[in-house]
């Protein structure tokens, strides 16, 4: 048993261009707090439950208000350490996630609103009982400086907190075969009670006769390194310290959600829906009361006066989840068809339809010609959600209201001359041609290619095109 301790030194803009805007302002004062999540091993993809080593939430930092015009400085931090107690042996290799949260202060119902500012993650080797290790991590334009260490809680000692120490029974020396417990020279190592042959480096025990293995070791005496050679098609990187990665269908493989949370895949990762009393990325933060402000986005917290009684978040319109942490994105399902736009009015969804479409989801193609008049003898043609008029000769435009020049398209063939006429156009054909558009050549013998010329018209006469 022992405690992992994290000391945040600073959180502020990192070096280089593109300094981030201050998360707080005169109009929006806020304060920071931090959350740390630890899990054993070096593999982020490993299927063990998240935050298996534990998680901790810091106190809230001092209220900060940005000075207008000043660059975002290092932001004021909460006092004290973040402490994550661990019950079993310290694994020696671990992964961490440190999140910086912003708490917006205001008088909204249900307390302040929280939003995640930055998240850093890493994998480290660390022996318990060693000195503070310093670290710098960057998340976007932000930089987080911190130190961490793992220390054993008495009577445990050693790099994995697996050796036990007891006060000396004699004032001068320890019993036969037992060493003094450095650095507590006035204590002696307790007699080993593990299974005979259990590796002193890679195994430990909490009960007499047992042999439990540290990360990366296996076998009855913890003497066999975990092998990767027998792994078949691992999904991600693996190493001798982490063992095989079990292939799976996706990010919810092995259910990364703790405490009975249910996992659902998202385009980039996964999302946990947490049961009441738990929240966090993987539902690993628990023992929450209303005093902790667990309801996000202005949710109203009811009940939960102590960690044993559940609280309930009453969410404002547009939010859901046991902690009101999820925005209700009903429009993201694209319910509106035919280019209609989706409006989420809180109490209801509405599709605003484009012209020519109707229905709750804009699914009905309207009779485009209903109530639409085409002027000057034009006829309405339906289609495509917008009516179209087929205009009579001499007229054009959307509704046939514009007078068209019937000769604009040069309809008379073979050099015939076009004349606009009240009922259309007239082609005066060049010698040797006839027809409404001068399209027929006249044969040299005087007979035309037509069966007969219409009565009263001689070849070469102007033909009126109706």
């Amino acid at each position: 048993a022992g405690v992992f301790e994290l000391q945040i030194h600073s959180f502020g803009p990192g070096p280089g261009p593109g300094a981030p805007r201050s998360p707080c302002s005169a109009r929006l004062p806020c304060r920071l707090f931090f959350r740390v999540c630890l899990k054993p091993g070096l593999s982020e993809e490993a299927a063990e439950s998240p935050c298996a080593l534990g998680a901790a939430l810091s106190a809230r930092g001092p209220v900060y208000t940005e000075q207008p015009g000043a660059p975002a400085p290092d932001l004021p931090l909460p006092d004290g350490l973040l402490q994550v107690p661990f019950r079993d042996a310290w694994p020696g290799t671990f992964s961490f996630i440190i999140e910086t949260w912003r708490e917006e202060l205001g008088d909204q119902i249900g307390g302040p609103a929280w939003s995640l500012l930055a998240r850093v993650a890493g994998r480290r080797r660390l022996a318990a009982g060693g000195p503070w290790a310093r670290d710098i991590q960057r998340a976007g334009a932000w930089e987080l400086r911190f130190s961490y260490r793992a220390r054993c809680e008495p009577p445990a000692v050693g790099t994995a907190c697996t050796r036990l120490c007891r006060p000396r029974s004699a004032p001068s020396r320890c019993g036969p075969g037992l060493r003094p417990c450095a650095p507590l020279e006035d204590e002696c190592e307790a007699p080993l009670v593990c299974r005979a042959g259990c590796s002193p480096e890679h195994g430990f025990c909490e009960q007499p006769g047992e042999c439990r293995c540290l990360e990366g070791w296996t076998g009855p005496l913890c003497t066999v390194p975990v092998s990767t050679s027998s792994c078949l098609s691992p999904r991600g990187p693996s190493s001798a310290t982490t063992g095989c990665l079990v292939p799976g269908p996706g990010p919810c493989d092995g259910n990364p959600c703790a405490n009975g949370g249910s996992c659902s895949e998202t385009p980039r990762s996964f999302e946990c829906t947490c049961p009441r009393g738990f929240y966090g990325l993987r539902c690993e933060v628990s023992g929450v009361t209303c005093a902790d402000g667990p309801c996000f986005n202005g949710g109203l917290c009811v009940g939960g006066a102590d960690p044993d009684s559940a609280y309930i978040c009453h969410c404002p319109p547009g939010f859901q989840g046991s902690n009101c942490e999820k925005r209700v994105d009903r429009c993201s399902l694209q319910p509106c068809r035919n280019g209609g736009l989706c409006l989420d009015l809180g109490h209801a969804l509405r599709c605003r339809c484009r012209a020519g479409f109707a229905g709750p989801r804009c699914e009905h193609d309207l009779d485009d010609c209903a109530g639409r008049a085409c002027a000057n003898g034009g006829t309405c043609v339906e289609g495509g959600g917008a009516h179209r008029c087929s205009c009579a000769l001499g007229f054009g435009g959307r509704d046939c209201r514009e007078r068209a020049d019937p000769c604009a398209a040069r309809p008379c063939a073979h050099g015939g001359r076009c004349y606009a006429h009240f009922s259309g156009l007239v082609c005066a054909c060049a010698p040797g041609y006839m027809g409404a558009r001068c399209e027929f050549p006249v044969h040299p013998d005087g007979a035309s290619a037509l069966p007969a010329a219409p009565p009263g018209l001689r070849p070469g006469d102007p033909q009126r095109y109706l």
Epitope: C331, Q334, C336, L341, C342, L343, D344, R352
Partner: antibody
Framework: QVQLQQSGPGLVKPSQTLSLTCAIS??????????WNWIRQSPSRGLEWLGR?????????DYAVSVKSRITINPDTSKNQFSLQLNSVTPEDTAVYHC??????????????WGQGTMVTVSS | QSVLTQPPSASGTPGQRVTISCSGS????????VSWYQQFPGTAPKLLIY???QRPSGVPDRFSGSKSGTSASLAISGLQSEDEADYYC???????????FGTGTKVTVL
């Protein structure tokens, strides 16, 4: 972080075509949950919405009645931008032109991200 | 020209509550959600309220919106000196088939 960067000339002669471009970073012009708009602002007319383009399985556009006969808004997916063309301009078209995103899911009418604005003067 | 009508100016002392009205018709405010924008000189407008009363993240809860019938209003409680700006309402207009904006209200902090 979504940003809109406008570009285009600040001076256009009467009867010519005003052309502006809005480059998008942090979002996609062909996203099926946003709407891309052009809006202008002048002392005489105040804020005036000109038109929009958006993608919902195919491209759609809508234009304000006041400019419908001479406006075109086109998306350019290869450059992740959209453009405004306003033909036959007159001094009345002198204004600050803004591109803006309607990007809140369920609130396409709310312009949550704006370009920096381009002052366009129509003068010979 | 602007279809939605706002008072040209409004003022208050620090800490006071100021309300700006926006009057429209059945084809805009009466049937569609209202947005509010804040604009400082020389900058683009900033979204303050959408869907009548929703605040985007980062907007203080001193700003609140409401709608009734064909009118909408923006309230600023606990007025601060940095609230001195122009404020515009906006909505979609079904008959014009386009967005319409308000005439704008200049808020002065005395």
């Amino acid at each position: 972080q979504v940003q809109l960067q406008q570009s285009g000339p600040g001076l256009v002669k009467p009867s010519q075509t005003l052309s502006l471009t809005c480059a998008i970073s942090g979002d996609s012009v062909s996203s099926n949950s946003v709407v891309w708009n052009w809006i202008r602002q002048s002392p005489s007319r105040g804020l005036e919405w000109l038109g929009r383009t958006y993608y919902r399985s195919k491209w759609y556009d809508d234009y304000a009645v006041s400019v419908k006969s001479r406006i075109t808004i086109n998306p350019d997916t290869s450059k992740n931008q959209f453009s405004l063309q306003l033909n036959s301009v007159t001094p009345e078209d002198t204004a600050v032109y803004h591109c803006a995103r309607g990007g809140i899911v369920g609130a396409p009418d709310a312009f949550d991200i704006w370009g920096q604005g381009t002052m366009v003067t129509v003068s010979s | 020209q602007s279809v939605l009508t706002q008072p040209p100016s409004a003022s208050g002392t620090p800490g006071q509550r100021v309300t700006i009205s926006c009057s429209g018709s059945s084809s805009n405010i009466g049937s569609d959600p209202v947005s509010w924008y804040q604009q400082f000189p020389g900058t683009a407008p900033k979204l303050l309220i959408y869907t009548n009363n929703q605040r985007p993240s980062g907007v203080p809860d001193r700003f609140s919106g409401s709608k009734s019938g064909t009118s909408a209003s923006l309230a600023i409680s606990g007025l601060q000196s940095e609230d001195e700006a122009d404020y515009y309402c906006a909505a979609w207009d079904d008959s014009l088939n386009g967005h319409v904006f308000g005439t704008g209200t200049k808020v002065t902090v005395l």
